[in-house]
């Protein structure tokens, strides 16, 4: 389906302000894709922890079509997209949808298939060249050899499209060989390897900070020369800077 033309006055539900839920709030230009391993290497209860991690990360992002766009995909031998980058919904509704992702518990979770899906479906057309593109690959299993023949090709394809791939290996069955291959493709492709889902909570803030640091800030709005520029102090807006690149909103 093609997007309907948008008039400058159109107000979408996602533009209706929702207050930030945490002190750290990433206000950057970012297209972020969450890929969730739906294999039985994670128990159903562990998969619930994985979803909690995704929802908690979403709470720390300024989600909108202007700032951080998100996609959420559960992968097994195929891929099931729950949220697309262009979905115009309020952040709270997107978090609710992410919380409802169903546990597949399949024998296989194919990283090759989901990276292919990311390359050819999610990032088929780059409609926001000014934004960073990041894929967070949450992996707890190893796909069979026969399925991984084109794995490197897809990772390279994503690199050509300037898509950063951040693998998060979880537990003893995560495919470390594939994680190392992803890391080798680009310096930004930093991996996080955790011994179990229990470590996701303590790694969450580091991961979200790393992602945020990879994304550009929005350029300041350009004003006609004869127009006075009004600036508002950070105290009034409640915005302060945590570091060189990311914004923090103090509640």
């Amino acid at each position: 389906p093609t997007d309907a033309p948008v008039s400058p006055t159109t107000l979408y539900v996602e533009d209706i302000s929702e207050p930030p839920l945490h002190d750290f709030y990433c206000s950057r230009l970012l297209d972020l894709v969450f890929l969730l391993d739906g294999s039985s290497r994670l128990s159903e209860a562990e998969f619930e922890v994985l979803k909690a991690f995704v929802v908690d990360m979403m709470e720390r992002l300024r989600i909108s079509q202007k700032w951080v766009r998100v996609a959420v995909v559960e992968y097994h031998d195929g891929s099931h997209a729950y949220i697309g980058l262009k979905d115009r919904k309020r952040p709270s509704e997107l978090r609710r949808i992410a919380s409802q992702v169903k546990y597949a518990g399949s024998q296989v979770a194919s990283t090759s298939e989901v990276l292919k899906y990311t390359l050819f479906q999610i990032f088929s057309k780059i409609d926001r060249p000014e934004a960073s593109r990041i894929t967070l690959l949450l992996m707890a299993s190893q796909e069979p050899q026969r399925m991984s023949r084109n794995f490197v090709r897809y990772v390279q394809g994503l690199k050509k499209k300037k898509v950063i791939v951040i693998p998060v290996g979880i537990g003893p069955h995560a495919n470390l060989k594939q994680i190392r291959l992803i890391e080798k493709q680009a310096p930004e492709n930093k991996a996080f390897v955790l011994s179990s889902v229990d470590e996701l909570e303590q790694q969450r803030d580091e991961i979200v900070s790393y992602l945020c640091d990879l994304a550009p800030e929005a350029p300041p709005p350009t004003l006609p020369p004869d127009m006075a520029q009004v600036t508002v102090g950070p105290g009034l807006l409640g915005v302060s800077t945590l570091g060189p690149k990311r914004n923090s909103m103090v509640l």
């Epitope: 128990s43 159903e44 209860a45 562990e46 998969f47 619930e48 922890v49 979803k51 909690a52 991690f53 919380s99 409802q100 992702v101 169903k102 546990y103 889902v197 229990d198 996701l200 909570e201």
Partner: nanobody, 126 residues
Framework: AVQLVDSGGGLVQAGGSLRLSCTAS?????????LGWFRQAPGKEREFVGG????????DYAEFAKGRFTISRDHAANTVYLEMNSLKPEDTAVYYC??????????????????WGQGTQVTVSS
Amino acid sequence: AVQLVDSGGGLVQAGGSLRLSCTASERTTFSSYTLGWFRQAPGKEREFVGGISWSGVSTDYAEFAKGRFTISRDHAANTVYLEMNSLKPEDTAVYYCAALGRYRSNWRNIGQYDYWGQGTQVTVSS
């Protein structure tokens, strides 16, 4: 801190049904917790009955509860329910609701739970 209030217990005949409720004091934190039901019969250890995930998508049951007991949650009402059917005299116990942080995956481990209800007595007569 989350306060949990258990209710709905009572005396019921074998083969009958009961619905227990567990209501939390705070809605904001309620949705962040996996909720478990435990029971303790006189002179026995407290045991896991079943649990429902923070999202409401996943449930887990002890073997004795499968097919007879159902756990559900109503986020709007801050409440978790334990629907018990085909009750047997051996189901007689004090039933407790407990809350577990959503980053914990071992729902059956009693020591993992952060908050507990006061318990509600269920008596099944033959």
